[in-house]
């Protein structure tokens, strides 16, 4: 067992532009109070489905009336921590919403109104225990800034509240097979061994020994299903054969009505009395309409007024979920090709091609070509989305626009020496060597060491040598 | 002024079921949000279950379990399955769609529930 704390810092406009109207008004002054939900494991789960760890309302805070002409700013907060409590272990991971809500104190016709002003939700890790974690969540053109945390109560102890602590019975050491109890050194672990035979699914202990059920289920070892038609009442006497209710509790210990709902005892059972916004006999419907402003991220809000309309929300680009609060990455389809760069604005998509391609997905294979002179007589040659040239003799360069020097990478070979000419180079060869490149040795008895010549080609040539 | 157009009313008795066309329509639905309104004799319109452009799907609290929506892309068309009807689901049902510029809505078909 423990309890989630949950300690609301601010709301108000979030960064950027766009700030929001102020919720209040001279005319209509109101305050702001908050609720959370909390359900265990990381699921999405819809905003109305239960909230399966527990709910918390907050006290109302301040009354606030906006100033004319001002921004709205951050908004009187009700005083003090919402708290959930939850019975069994904590689950480690789970999700919450926290809404705002906003009371109207105007001249109401049968008392406030209430409205939802902005939903957060996320899903978390957390270990019972720990320091307090801060978080900055936005709803539309809200911010909301807060800190949680869930400790345990004692004499639980854990990460998961489910080790329990007992004072030593011997001042110096903790019994055999035992722990201290950190942080409570002076505690020992408690060997936690219910009654034999105790349902694991429908019981639990706190004391060792003891088979305490879960709701629904009764008897010594809770393997009994609880039904009340063979009871006198509906909190008459009890056995575990029968299988009736335990007397004692009243129909509304442990306050069946979700939602910040009040319960009330009625003759036979209970009934719940329901804010704004939610009904059914626990208040465990959602009843939110577009007058709640359900819509995120600029969506736009499709429905009737009537609390059974449904709604929808037209998402803007780049938002998806029922009410838009998902961010879609959607870069991550790779909707630009041929190794185009996908960012996403927001608004809009966008695809920053590479060199010879170009179209909104970077579709278009240009012609590499097209437009791009090679200078000095060079041709221009394609190839993967980028051009080069084929430059003339004595041209370099991209564009072949540089005069090469032809002598500058040391072309003659054996010492010969380079000149450059208008045809390109000629080499001077060393005494012994000859060919254009003076390749080739001169044997001393003046035969060459020339190779055969090919076909057309007679040996000594002229152009078997340029 | 382009208008959707609804098929599919009728007379029909408690329990039973009908099906609601809206469509072929040269209004493209994918990338709208789209959904079915009905309204009852003296009272508002309201919206009876909707698909947004991205998706999600959403039913009043009286029909859910009862009414089902769909749209058929390719068709261009959208649908509502209505099943175990009640009396006061007796109503004008009205196609509707809508992007962030403009809404379209059709003429309305009657769906009367009697036994």
């Known amino acids: 067992a423990g309890v989630f704390e949950l300690q609301i810092h601010s709301f108000g406009p979030g960064p950027g532009p766009g700030a929001p109207r102020s919720p209040c008004s001279a005319r209509l002054p109101c305050r702001l109070f908050f609720r959370v939900c909390l359900k265990p494991g990381l699921s999405e789960e819809a905003a109305e489905s239960p909230c399966a760890l527990g709910a918390a309302l907050s006290a109302r805070g301040p009354v606030y009336t906006e100033q004319p002409g001002a921004p709205a700013p951050d908004l009187p907060l009700p005083d003090g921590l919402l708290q959930v409590p939850f019975r069994d272990a904590w689950p480690g991971t789970f999700s919450f919403i926290i809404e705002t809500w906003r009371e109207e104190l105007g001249d109401q016709i049968g008392g406030p109104a209430w409205s939802l002003l902005a939903r957060v939700a996320g899903r978390r890790r957390l270990a019972a225990g720990g320091p307090w974690a801060r978080d900055i969540q936005r709803a539309g053109a809200w911010e909301l800034r807060f800190s949680y945390r869930a400790r345990c109560e004692p004499p639980a102890v854990g990460t998961a509240c489910t080790r329990l602590c007992r004072p030593r019975s011997a001042p110096s050491r903790c019994g055999p097979g035992l722990r201290p109890c950190a942080p409570l050194e002076d505690e020992c672990e408690a060997p936690l061994v219910c009654r034999a035979g105790c349902s694991p699914e429908h019981g639990f202990c706190e004391q060792p020994g003891e088979c305490r059920c879960l709701e629904g289920w009764t008897g010594p070892l809770c393997t009994v299903p609880v039904s009340t038609s063979s009871c006198l009442s509906p909190r008459g006497p009890s056995s575990a054969t029968t299988g009736c209710l335990v007397p004692g509790p009243g129909p509304c210990d442990g306050n069946p009505c979700a939602n910040g709902g009040s319960c009330s005892e009625t003759p036979r059972s209970f009934e719940c009395t329901c804010p704004r916004g939610f009904y059914g006999l626990r208040c465990e419907v959602s009843g939110v309409t577009c007058a709640d402003g359900p819509c995120f991220n600029g969506g736009l809000c499709v429905g009737g007024a009537d609390p059974d309309s449904a709604y929808i929300c037209h998402c803007p680009p780049g938002f998806q979920g029922s009410n838009c609060e998902k961010r879609v990455d959607r870069c991550s389809l790779q909707p630009c090709r041929n190794g185009g760069l996908c960012l996403d604005l927001g608004h809009a998509l966008r695809c920053r091609c590479r060199a010879g391609f170009a179209g909104p997905r970077c579709e278009h294979d240009l012609d590499d070509c097209a437009g791009r002179a090679c200078a000095n007589g060079g041709t221009c040659v394609e190839g993967g989305g980028a051009h080069r040239c084929s430059c003339a003799l004595g041209f370099g360069g991209r564009d072949c626009r540089e005069r090469a020097d032809p002598c500058a990478a040391r072309p003659c070979a054996h010492g010969g020496r380079c000149y450059a000419h208008f045809s390109g180079l000629v080499c001077a060869c060393a005494p012994g060597y000859m060919g254009a490149r003076c390749e080739f040795p001169v044997h001393p008895d003046g035969a060459s060491a020339l190779p055969a010549a090919p076909p057309g080609l007679r040996p000594g040539d002229p152009q078997r040598y340029l | 002024e382009v208008q959707l157009v609804e098929s599919g009313g009728g007379e029909v008795q408690p329990g039973g079921s009908l099906r609601l066309s809206c469509g072929p329509s040269e209004i493209i639905f994918s990338d709208k949000s789209v959904g079915w309104w009905r309204q009852a004799p003296g009272k508002q319109r309201n919206l009876v279950a909707g698909?947004?452009?991205?998706?999600?799907?959403n039913y009043a609290q009286s029909v859910k379990g009862r009414f089902t929506i769909s749209r058929d892309n390719a068709k261009n068309t959208l649908y509502l399955q209505m099943s175990s009807l009640r009396a006061e689901d007796t109503a004008v049902y009205y196609c509707?769609?809508?992007?962030?510029?403009?809404?379209?809505w059709g003429q309305g078909t009657l769906v009367t529930v009697k036994p």
């Open positions: 509707y769609a809508r992007d962030f510029e403009n809404e379209y």
């Open positions: 698909i947004s452009n991205v998706g999600s799907t």
